[in-house]
Amino acid sequence: MAVTACQGLGFVVSLIGIAGIIAATCMDQWSTQDLYNNPVTAVFNYQGLWRSCVRESSGFTECRGYFTLLGLPAMLQAVRALMIVGIVLGAIGLLVSIFALKCIRIGSMEDSAKANMTLTSGIMFIVSGLCAIAGVSVFANMLVTNFWMSTANMYTGMGGMVQTVQTRYTFGAALFVGWVAGGLTLIGGVMMCIACRGLAPEETNYKAVSYHASGHSVAYKPGGFKASTGFGSNTKNKKIYDGGARTEDEVQSYPSKHDYV
C-alpha cells in the first residue's frame, strides 16, 4: 500500500512540477524592471525567454518576440535549451510513469517491468527538475551580474548636462515558479525511485523452503516465481515473490533477510 501511495504521490508531484516548468518557460516575467525607490512607474519593462514586453501606466502593453537566433546572448540560448530539455524529459517521464503506475493494469505487465519503468521515469523527473533548476539559476546569475554592472554605470553622464538612466532588471515571477517547479519535479522523481525499490522483486540467498498447511502446499524457491499451484482458485489473486516481499492481499508474512535494500 505504501509503495502505491509513494508512486502515486511521486507522479502527482512530478506532474505539478512539470506543469510549473512549462508555465515558467512560457512566462514573460523572467526579469522585471527594478523599481528601486519608485513603486509607480510610467513605463514598466519585463522580459521572458521568448519576448520582451513594455507596460505603460496607461494600461497599454506591447510585447515583441526575439525574432533572431544568432543575435541572442549565448546564456539565454543555454537557458532556453535547459528548459526545453527539462520539459521534454519530464513529458516522456510522465508518459512512462502512467504505464508504470501500480494502480493501472495494462495487459499482463509484470511488476518487475513496472519497477523498471518507475525507476526510468523517476530518473527522468530528477534530470528534468535539475535542468529547470539549472536553467533558472543560470538566468538568475546573469541578472545579478547585469544588475551590478548597470548599477555601476547607472549615473553615467551625471557630470554633463544630459543624464541617462539605465534600466536595471531584477528577478521576475517566472524564476520563482521555475525554482519551485524544478524542486517539485526533483522530489517527485526521488519518490518514484523510492517506490521502484518497493516494487522490484528482491533476490535472496535462502534455500527452497516448503510450507505445509491443511493438505495444500506451496514450495518457495530462490530466484523463481510460484513453483506449485496448491491454492487452486485462490492463486489468481496472489503472486508470490522471492525474498519474502509480499503483495497487499497476503495475510502471512514470510522470513526475509531484509524488506528493502
Epitope: A42, V43, N45, S52, E56, S57, S58, G59, Q163, T164
Partner: antibody, heavy 118, light 113 residues
Framework: EVQLVQSGAEVKKPGASVKVSCKAS????????MHWVRQAPGQRLEWMGM????????NYNEKFKGRVTLTLDKSASTAYMELSSLRSEDTAVYYC???????????WGQGTTVTVSS | DIVMTQSPDSLAVSLGERATINCKSS????????????LTWYQQKPGQPPKLLIY???TRESGVPDRFSGSGSGTDFTLTISSLQAEDVAVYYC?????????FGQGTKLEIK
C-alpha cells in the same frame, strides 16, 4: 463621444481648500487613469497626480504631496481633486485629463479656474 | 525630475511655410524595452485645454492633420509643421511621458509673420 466636464470657477481665501469635480462620459470610466494638471497664468503645465477609477490607487507629484487629495465617485463616474492650504500661487486653471497609449492625455476637461485671493 | 526645455520661446512663420519647434529633455526619454521615445506634443489655443498632437515622439494622434510631424530620439526632439495654416496659431508644449512626475516644456508661441 468622450467628454470630461469640470465644475465651475472658484474664488478662495488663502489657507482654505478647494474641491474640483470632473464628470466623465462616453467611455468606461474604470478603464482609464484620471490625471490632474494645472496651469498658472503664463506658466507651463504642471502635473499634479493621478487616480485609477477601478482600484482607487493614487500617485501624487511630490510638490503637492500632503496638500492634494484625489478621490472618486464610481457610481457617478466622477473624479475629484481637493487642494488644501491654498496660497496665492495656487491661482491657476485646473484640468482633469484621461491617460491613453503612449502615456499621453487624449481628452481634457474644459478647465476650472481657481483664484486664491485675500 | 526631468526638465523639458523648448526653443524658441516664440516663433513667427509665414502662411504655407515650415515651422520647427525644438524640445530638449534633461534625461533620455528612450525606453530600451520597446525602443520608443516617450515624448508627447500638445497644441493649446487661448481659452482651451491642450490638444494631443503626437505621442511616442513621432506617432500622430488620429484626426491630426498630416502636416504635423514629430521626430528625434533620446533627449532631442522636433515638432514640424510642414505648411503653416492660420488655425495652427497656438502655444505648443512638449511633455515627458517617460517618468513620473510628468513634466512639460515652457511652451513655444507660434504666430503668423
Amino acid at each position: 463621444e468622450v467628454q470630461l466636464v469640470q465644475s465651475g470657477a472658484e474664488v478662495k481665501k488663502p489657507g482654505a481648500s478647494v474641491k474640483v469635480s470632473c464628470k466623465a462620459s462616453g467611455y468606461t470610466f474604470t478603464s482609464y487613469w484620471m490625471h490632474w494638471v494645472r496651469q498658472a497664468p503664463g506658466q507651463r503645465l504642471e502635473w499634479m497626480g493621478m487616480i485609477h477609477p477601478n482600484s482607487g490607487s493614487t500617485n501624487y507629484n511630490e510638490k503637492f504631496k500632503g496638500r492634494v487629495t484625489l478621490t472618486l465617485d464610481k457610481s457617478a463616474s466622477t473624479a475629484y481633486m481637493e487642494l488644501s492650504s491654498l496660497r496665492s500661487e495656487d491661482t491657476a486653471v485646473y484640468y482633469c485629463a484621461r491617460l491613453k497609449t503612449g502615456n499621453s492625455f487624449d481628452y481634457w476637461g474644459q478647465g476650472t479656474t481657481v483664484t486664491v485671493s485675500s | 525630475d526631468i526638465v523639458m526645455t523648448q526653443s524658441p520661446d516664440s516663433l513667427a512663420v509665414s502662411l504655407g511655410e515650415r515651422a520647427t519647434i525644438n524640445c530638449k529633455s534633461s534625461q533620455s526619454l528612450l525606453n530600451s524595452g520597446n525602443q520608443k521615445n516617450y515624448l508627447t506634443w500638445y497644441q493649446q489655443k487661448p481659452g482651451q485645454p491642450p490638444k494631443l498632437l503626437i505621442y511616442w515622439a513621432s506617432t500622430r494622434e488620429s484626426g491630426v492633420p498630416d502636416r504635423f510631424s514629430g521626430s528625434g530620439s533620446g533627449t532631442d526632439f522636433t515638432l514640424t509643421i510642414s505648411s503653416l495654416q492660420a488655425e495652427d496659431v497656438a502655444v505648443y508644449y512638449c511633455q515627458n511621458a517617460y517618468t513620473y512626475p510628468f513634466t512639460f516644456g515652457q511652451g513655444t508661441k507660434l504666430e503668423i509673420k
